[in-house]
């Protein structure tokens, strides 16, 4: 069964700046990745970025830089300042759509310690 992992890290240089990394552990080819915060995209979450392998990347504030790391993983840097900036207990979710298997999603938040956290 495919799985999605989510890692949330606060940047040491900018304490209110976050990096979210997500990956897909499965055999299908990824068609679309949606990153949201405040919950899953279909359950009240707000979309931060949508990454398509052919048609490019769309992102919305406070997302600063979304990119593909590999064919099955992505990263997203969030701007740290402003009214819409995330806080330490914000939940981030990643949804990977794979054709024709379907979609898998997982959420994660900043771990209690300052060490990078892994959540599946």
């Amino acid at each position: 069964t495919p799985e999605v992992w989510v890692q949330v890290r606060m940047e040491a240089t900018e304490l209110s700046s976050f990096t979210i990394r997500c990956g897909f552990l499965g055999s299908g080819s990824i068609s679309l990745v949606t990153v949201s915060w405040g919950g899953p995209n279909g359950a009240g979450g707000t979309t931060l970025a949508v990454l398509h392998p052919e048609r490019g990347i769309r992102q919305w504030a406070p997302a600063r830089q979304a990119r593909w790391e590999t064919q099955s993983s992505i990263s997203l840097i969030l701007e740290g300042s402003g009214a819409s900036s995330p806080c330490a207990n914000t939940t981030f979710c990643c949804k990977f759509a794979s054709f024709p298997e379907g979609s898998w999603e997982a959420c994660g938040s900043l771990p209690p310690s300052s060490d990078p956290g892994l959540s599946a």
């Epitope: 080819s29 068609s31 679309l32 359950a43 398509h52 759509a97 054709f99 024709p100 379907g102």
Partner: antibody
Framework: EVQLVESGGGLVKPGGSLRLSCAAS????????MSWVRQAPGKGLELVSA????????YYPDTVKGRFTISRDDAENSLYLQMNSLRAEDTAVYYC?????????????WGQGTLVTVSS | EIVMTQSPPTLSLSPGERVTLSCKAS??????VAWYQEKPGQAPRLLIY???HRFTGIPARFSGSGSGTDFTLTISSLQPEDFAVYYC?????????FGQGTKLEIK
């Protein structure tokens, strides 16, 4: 304008074979996942085959697995469905459809359908 | 397999009426739900994708809502051309499945 035009339907005896074709135009065919959906007389819609845009991934329900084969020719902008060992219950209108990644794989374009009748 | 159950199977209504069609999934399908309209002799037509997004050219009287397992398609004021069969569809998990359809007929 997006257009999908099916052909190849007709009357065939049980155990026989047919090859359906779908000619696509008005969009970059190679960038889209494609499917065949059928509707038997008086019944609902059933997805009978799907193929990813790169052609590497395919899907078949148990009802047709081992008998139907989906393929695509991006150079010809065409989708195919090879149907072997046909049964009476395969009688239906067969539609070619296009999936839109950004719409959660919803099928945003359909052909007009081609009728397949399996009868002795 | 995720089963999509539509209700009711048939509805008899008059033009101008408001109608709500129901679709229940046997397990959560996130927001990967679409609605299609089918008329006799015509190909299905996409109305709604991602639960609530109207497809290009679809009139504002059509709206979708729901989350998780319960979804609805609402037509605010039925027009003569709206009498057709409506299908919900999930593309969240393979095998992708359709509901059995709800037929809207003129009273």
């Amino acid at each position: 304008e997006v257009q999908l035009v099916e052909s190849g339907g007709g009357l065939v005896k049980p155990g026989g074979s047919l090859r359906l074709s779908c000619a696509a135009s008005g969009f970059t065919f190679s960038s889209y996942h494609m499917s065949w959906v059928r509707q038997a007389p008086g019944k609902g819609l059933e997805l009978v085959s799907a193929i990813s845009r790169d052609g590497d991934s395919t899907y078949y329900p148990d009802t047709v697995k081992g008998r139907f084969t989906i393929s695509r020719d991006d150079a010809e902008n065409s989708l195919y469905l090879q149907m072997n060992s046909l049964r009476a219950e395969d009688t239906a209108v067969y539609y070619c459809s296009r999936h839109e990644d950004y719409f959660g794989f919803a099928m945003d374009s359909w052909g007009q359908g081609t009728l397949v009748t399996v009868s002795s | 397999e995720i089963v999509m159950t539509q209700s009711p199977p048939t509805l008899s209504l008059s033009p101008g009426e408001r109608v709500t069609l129901s679709c229940k999934a046997s397990q959560s399908v996130s927001n990967d739900v679409a609605w299609y309209q089918e008329k006799p002799g015509q190909a299905p037509r996409l109305l709604i994708y991602y639960v609530s997004h109207r497809f290009t050219g679809i009139p504002a009287r059509f709206s979708g809502s729901g989350s998780g397992t319960d979804f609805t398609l609402t037509i605010s004021s039925l027009q003569p051309e709206d009498f057709a069969v409506y299908y919900c569809h999930q593309a969240y998990r393979s095998p992708w499945t359709f509901g059995q359809g709800t037929k809207l007929e003129i009273k």
